[in-house]
């Protein structure tokens, strides 16, 4: 299973649920569904209040039980480490795959943390992060922001992911904006 890691704003906008949580239990495989289940302890929720309704406490995250079908394998054994988890809701259960955005909270830049906490949501309705995988790239709409991180190397590598959000500048126009300049 291979997939290009999404821009964190894309991950936020395309997910039903975005939370901060600790992986606290050993994984179990359900003998009927053949899905693997990780026990988690949720510490914060950034998206999904409406989708979840009253069941606002997520205790488990589900993933296919095999790598080749995009199952997520949690490598950290540190049960106190917090992770940002962006996933989909299926039948009220949080599902993730290899292609989901799952990252240690401490590995996120301050700008990304600000994005997940409050800023990315502003761009979800109108704006689209458009991946540029090979040159030349052409914007298909004024609401697209060209994401060129995959083309860059060195100190510029990952700059848009780590520091920028695609946000409305005016109706019908979205641009890259620094998350540093957003009010914390």
């Amino acid at each position: 299973c291979t997939c290009v890691p999404p821009h964190p704003q894309t991950a936020f906008c395309n997910s039903d649920l975005v939370i901060r949580a600790k992986f606290v239990g050993t994984p179990e495989v359900n003998q009927t569904t053949l899905y693997q289940r990780y026990e988690i302890k949720m510490t914060k929720m950034y998206k999904g209040f409406q989708a979840l309704g009253d069941a606002a406490d997520i205790r488990f995250v589900y993933t296919p039980a095999m790598e080749s079908v995009c199952g997520y394998f949690h490598r950290s054994h540190n049960r106190s480490e917090e992770f940002l988890i962006a996933g989909k809701l299926q039948d009220g259960l949080l599902h993730i795959t290899t292609c989901s955005f799952v990252a240690p909270w401490n590995s996120l830049s301050l700008a990304q943390r600000r994005g997940f906490t409050k800023t990315y949501t502003v761009g979800c309705e109108e704006c689209t992060v458009f991946p540029c995988l090979s040159i030349p790239c052409k914007l298909q709409s004024g609401t697209h922001c060209l994401w060129t991180d995959q083309l860059l190397q060195g100190s510029e590598k990952g700059f848009q992911s780590r520091h920028l959000a695609c946000l409305p500048r005016e109706p019908g126009l979205c641009t890259w904006q620094s998350l540093r300049s957003q009010i914390a």
């Epitope: 495989v29 569904t33 899905y35 095999m66």
Partner: antibody, heavy 118, light 110 residues
Framework: QVQLVESGGGLVQPGGSLRLSCAAS????????MSWVRQAPGKGLEWVSA????????YYADSVKGRFTISRDNSKNTLYLQMNSLRAEDTAVYYC???????????WGQGTLVTVSS | DIALTQPASVSGSPGQSITISCTGT?????????VSWYQQHPGKAPKLMIY???NRPSGVSNRFSGSKSGNTASLTISGLQAEDEADYYC??????????FGGGTKLTVL
């Protein structure tokens, strides 16, 4: 009593196709994930494929991926294995088995022999 | 492609105890408590003897026991009897291969 009965095995030429069936009885079929396991003559057991109780999740061994398809019909209490592009190394007794606790196999069929030869 | 390593053969006299090892990796035996053991007599389907490392299904003699240490699981048969002569296979869940079996161990009762 709880029982699994395989059928559909036989002699087939390399590159040919075969569909195995496994009829289940004595338990609520849809509540159990099922699997196919094979055993080449004089050799050990090899896991082939698995399918969840609903049929929504399927898993395959690398050796059969892209050639074999596992499926199930819960209304008929039947498990299937569609085998295409068969090779000599697919020659084996094929068992269907029921997943139980800890992903163990608690119920096995009697097996059906598949021979791939020209 | 055998994922779990078992000795090809072991032997023991009636009344003795024998142990069969099953060595894997941290992604199968070592990573989960999903190790099972099967007994197979010639021409017959395998029979589940141990699941979840050390649990016995009902109807299986308490002479059979299982354990695990690190990446190695073990099946011990105490008070060996003639009818224990068979092939024994270990099996484990593996995140990368889903299900893996050992190559099998032929138990001979002398």
């Amino acid at each position: 009593q709880v029982q699994l009965v395989e059928s559909g095995g036989g002699l087939v030429q390399p590159g040919g196709s075969l569909r195995l069936s496994c009829a289940a009885s004595g338990f609520t079929f849809s509540s159990y994930a099922m699997s196919w396991v094979r055993q080449a003559p004089g050799k050990g057991l090899e896991w082939v494929s698995a399918i969840s109780g609903s049929g929504g999740s399927t898993y395959y061994a690398d050796s059969v991926k892209g050639r074999f398809t596992i499926s199930r019909d819960n209304s008929k209490n039947t498990l299937y294995l569609q085998m295409n592009s068969l090779r000599a190394e697919d020659t084996a007794v094929y068992y269907c088995a029921r997943y139980w606790r800890g992903l163990s196999f608690d119920i096995w069929g009697q097996g059906t022999l598949v021979t791939v030869s020209s | 492609d055998i994922a779990l390593t078992q000795p090809a053969s072991v032997s023991g006299s009636p009344g003795q105890s024998i142990t069969i090892s099953c060595t894997g990796t941290s992604s199968d035996v070592g990573g989960y408590n999903y190790v099972s053991w099967y007994q197979q007599h010639p021409g017959k389907a395998p029979k589940l003897m141990i699941y979840d490392v050390s649990n016995r299904p009902s109807g299986v003699s308490n002479r059979f026991s299982g354990s695990k240490s690190g990446n190695t699981a073990s099946l011990t048969i105490s008070g060996l009897q003639a009818e224990d002569e068979a092939d024994y296979y270990c099996q484990s869940y593996d995140f990368y291969k889903f299900n893996v079996f050992g190559g099998g161990t032929k138990l001979t009762v002398l």
